[in-house]
Amino acid sequence: TIDTKRNISAEEGGSVILQCHFSSDTAEVTQVDWKQQDQLLAIYSVDLGWHVASVFSDRVVPGPSLGLTFQSLTMNDTGEYFCTYHTYPGGIYKGRIFLKVQES
């Protein structure tokens, strides 16, 4: 299962940690995708490690763990964020976070 804070808020110009916690007794995580709506932020794979999409490379830092740290937030960053955990065996698990960026 995926456990996450459904709604989080942060100040404009600040940073926020996007975190999904995956728990399973048997399944192993092979890949994690993070998306802002439909746009890829970053992807982790067991083989290749983390890769951050170039459009976000100056604002998105992988970690802690399989989460993301999103920096220099703007009002336009308000919206839905999705984590997708690819696991073996066990399939795909998704989590949703709504981020509200507030004026500082």
Epitope: D33, L48, G49, W50, H51, V52, A53, S54, P62, G63
Partner: antibody
Framework: EVQLVESGGGLTQPGKSLKLSCEAS????????MHWVRQSPGKGLEWVAF????????FYADAVRGRFTISRDNAKNLLFLQMNDLKSEDTAMYYC????????????WGQGTLVTVSS | DIVMTQSPSSLAVSPGEKVTMTCKSS????????????LAWYQQKPGQSPKLLIY???IRFTGVPDRFTGSGSGTDYTLTITSVQAEDMGQYFC?????????FGDGTKLEIK
């Protein structure tokens, strides 16, 4: 400022062992995947091994698998390469290098330590 | 393993001239997961360790002058130096990041006339 300083190289004979160290400073060492890359005299670059940050997952080049062991001590900001059963073709400058968080490259390199294997 | 082939192996140019070097990979370096080509370029000056110039085929690393430009996709990549300076002398290596083991090209040696 990111700094990587290798040590432990030297002249040794085939079949012998050496242990290389890399001391890291200026960044949160425990968060980064670290690599060893070597360069034979006058030649190109050859990736040797990496060790992931959190998981400690390791991977080796075929040429060294079973003879070399990569490890790290996050408390002391140290990266190691234990080299056993050395061969003349292992003669090279050995660099430790940091993988940046967001892409599969090497964004910081040490100055290198020279390993010479000769009888 | 992915084989990286660089050409030319060496070239000599005068300061101010434009330089182009190429790197070909034995398979595509496009990573659909992040929609990027996992190709990097490094510069190694004599007696020094390599320095990262370009990643994702075309993105300049921090502090790299804009006379260095990377381009290409799939299996074919190019590093261009517009208006070469004396300090650009050295060896240039490409590196693929799509498969383990990570592999480098044999390098292009740039000499200044």
């Amino acid at each position: 400022e990111v700094q990587l300083v290798e040590s432990g190289g030297g002249l040794t004979q085939p079949g012998k062992s050496l242990k290389l160290s890399c001391e890291a400073s200026g960044f949160t060492f425990s968060s980064f995947t670290m690599h060893w890359v070597r360069q034979s005299p006058g030649k190109g670059l050859e990736w040797v091994a990496f060790i992931r940050s959190g998981s400690g997952i390791v991977f080796y080049a075929d040429a060294v698998r079973g003879r070399f062991t990569i490890s790290r001590d996050n408390a002391k900001n140290l990266l190691f390469l234990q080299m056993n059963d050395l061969k003349s073709e292992d003669t090279a400058m050995y660099y430790c290098a940091r993988r940046p968080l967001g892409h599969n490259t090497f964004d910081s390199w040490g100055q290198g330590t020279l390993v010479t294997v000769s009888s | 393993d992915i084989v990286m082939t660089q050409s030319p192996s060496s070239l000599a140019v005068s300061p101010g001239e434009k330089v182009t070097m190429t790197c070909k990979s034995s398979q595509s370096l496009y990573y659909s997961g992040v929609k990027e080509n996992l190709l990097a370029w490094y510069q190694q000056k004599p007696g020094q360790s390599p320095k990262l110039l370009i990643y994702y085929a075309s993105i300049r690393f921090t502090g790299v002058p804009d006379r260095f430009t990377g381009s290409g996709s799939g299996t074919d990549y190019t590093l261009t130096i517009t208006s070469v300076q004396a300090e650009d002398m050295g060896q240039y290596f490409c590196q693929q990041g799509i498969n383990n083991p990570l592999t480098f090209g044999d390098g292009t040696k740039l000499e200044i006339k």
